[in-house]
């Protein structure tokens, strides 16, 4: 709960953001989870805590592990975990999955190409943008701000995208790279309030006690490629994680389709032998973008066996 | 545009309870604390105390400890704030306010007039 | 507790030109992390309180840039530089520093 995963480069710059947020928050407290010792303030350290962020300046392999942040604040202390990973330099061109981030969509009218967690960082442009390792030359590509903008992109811009940039800490200087992959949509679009197609709003569905069941959260966000949209379940108003049932899982990533044009998201939430008390539970399906929340709520019903007679 | 909707007001008699909601809407209910207010016009603006949705957690004046219980429900994005063993002391608006990350009381609902009389 | 305090009233002011609002903590809102933990909030007649200063010196989303505030750990002000009519109501001072959390007794804005 309240952990999120980090990676890195060895001999790179690595900042993490702690995974809870105050609200507000008025210090933040970074411990090493396995010995419990607390990280330095002092930026003297190769690795040292600033506010909301831990920094590796630069990451080592050994520093791989679980980091414990305590936001703190005058009403209430929370806790997060930070999963770090530091990796070996790869040395082929080969960015081996692990090491990628999400992939990003563009089209004709909007191929911008963000680098993954820059805002994190102290740097200067420009930004130094290389595809499937090769740096990327010619008057298309403009490195702009912390993304890259292609000009009349095509199918063959798909690929794999490292950005890199120097951040800069009292005046040392620590190179950083990301990778994200790049599809290539051929559509223009438009994005609007999030439309859920499925469920619908406070349905009832029948179920079977000890069967499999599955519901599927579907929403449409506009047309075209969807830079911030999200469909997911909760259970009571918790998240799928955080509720503890093994039984019941969210299909793991989001499906997209393009239903008349449109941009949709699928999420199935998958039930596993279902019980009495799943029925007691309220599923909401929630669907966000940058214009809002939408959500509708589903509730299970016992549905009775069918008995086949010969 | 985030928004606090409040319960209406409320007449109830000395000793008795109520329970005063607060439903937010247009922002993820988890991401805020929801605090409550209370105004008159001898004591001013007073501090009640918080509510974290996200977990439950909860921060009390000391001075309205045993008088208000605060609870949230997740599902409906509803904040609740029970008053019990009500006395005169009691009539006021009551505020409920929702944080940011830079600030406690950075959303208000409407306010419910409470009034407790015989 | 944090007593923060306020006078009932202002200056009469004329709309046009600036007003002061004074605000006394009984201890030093200033943290360790740096941040002077003052807020400025506005009831006008009939409604809610309302944001208007946060961390003693920046502006809220949505409030005009006539208000501003400047203090020192423990003495505080704010200034409206062009009295507008809709300014009108009372100016509440809080502190956020540690629990309870406690606000100003009010100073009310007259215009003239």
């Known amino acids: 709960k309240f952990s999120k995963q980090s990676w890195g480069l060895e001999n790179e710059a690595l900042i993490v953001r702690c995974p809870r947020q105050g609200k507000p928050s008025y210090t933040v407290d970074w411990y090493y989870s396995q010995t419990n010792k607390s990280i330095p303030t002092q930026e003297r350290n190769r690795v040292f805590a600033s506010g909301q962020l831990l920094k590796f300046l630069p990451a080592a392999v050994a520093d791989s592990g679980i980091y414990t942040c305590i936001v703190r604040s005058p009403t209430f202390n929370r806790t997060g975990y930070a999963n770090v990973t530091i990796y070996k330099k790869q040395s082929d061109c080969n960015v081996p999955d692990y090491l990628m981030y999400s992939t990003v969509s563009g089209s004709e009218k909007n191929s911008k190409i963000y680098c993954p967690t820059i805002d994190l960082y102290n740097w200067t442009a420009p930004l130094e943008w290389f595809k499937n390792c090769q740096a990327l030359q010619g008057s298309r590509y403009r490195a702009h701000k912390s993304f890259l903008v292609i000009d009349n992109v095509m199918t063959e811009d798909a690929g794999d995208y490292t950005c890199k940039f120097i951040h800069n800490e009292n005046g040392a200087n620590y190179s950083v790279t990301a990778t994200r992959s790049f599809t290539v949509k051929d559509e223009q679009g438009f994005s609007l309030f999030p439309v859920i197609g499925a469920p619908a709003q406070n349905e009832i569905k029948e179920v079977e006690i000890g069967k499999n069941a599955n519901l599927t959260c579907s929403a449409c966000f506009g047309k075209g490629t969807q830079f911030l949209a999200a469909v997911l379940w909760q259970l009571n108003g918790t998240k799928i994680t955080d509720f503890g049932e093994p039984r019941i899982q969210q299909e793991e990533g989001q499906n997209q389709s393009f239903s008349n044009g449109l941009a949709c998201l699928d999420m199935v939430l998958r039930i596993a032998d279902v019980k009495e008390e799943d029925l007691l539970l309220q599923y909401d399906c929630l669907a966000l973008n940058l214009h809002g929340l939408r959500r509708h709520t589903v509730r299970l019903s016992r549905k009775n066996p069918i008995d086949h007679h010969s | 545009q985030v928004q606090l909707q409040q319960s209406g007001a409320e007449l109830v008699r000395p000793g008795a309870s109520v329970t005063l909601s607060c439903k937010a809407s247009?922002?993820?209910?988890?991401?805020?604390?929801i605090h409550w207010v209370k105004q008159t016009l001898v004591h001013g603006l007073e501090w009640i105390g918080a509510?974290?949705?996200?977990?439950?957690?909860?921060a009390y004046n000391q001075k309205f400890k045993g008088k208000a219980t605060l609870t949230a429900d997740k599902s409906s994005s509803t904040a609740y704030m029970e008053l019990s063993s009500l006395t005169s002391e009691g009539s006021a608006v009551y505020y409920c306010s929702g944080s940011t990350t830079d600030c406690y009381f950075a959303y208000w609902g409407q306010g419910t007039t409470l009034t407790v009389s015989s | 507790d944090i007593v923060m305090t306020q006078a009932a009233f202002s200056n009469p002011v004329t709309l046009g030109t600036s007003a002061s609002i004074s605000c006394r903590s009984s201890?030093?809102?200033?943290?360790?992390?740096?941040?002077?933990?003052l807020y400025w909030y506005l009831q006008k007649p009939g409604q809610s309180p309302q944001l208007l200063i946060y961390q003693m010196s920046n502006l809220a989303s949505g409030v005009p840039d006539r208000f501003s505030s400047s203090g020192s750990g423990t003495d505080f002000t704010l200034r409206i530089s062009r009295v507008e009519a809709e300014d009108v109501g009372v100016y509440y001072c809080a502190q956020n520093l540690e629990l309870p959390f406690t606000f100003g007794s009010g100073t009310k804005l007259e215009i003239k």
């Open positions: 509510i974290d949705p996200e977990t439950g957690d909860t």
């Open positions: 201890k030093s809102l200033l943290h360790s992390n740096g941040i002077i933990y």
């Open positions: 247009d922002y993820i209910f988890t991401d805020s604390e």
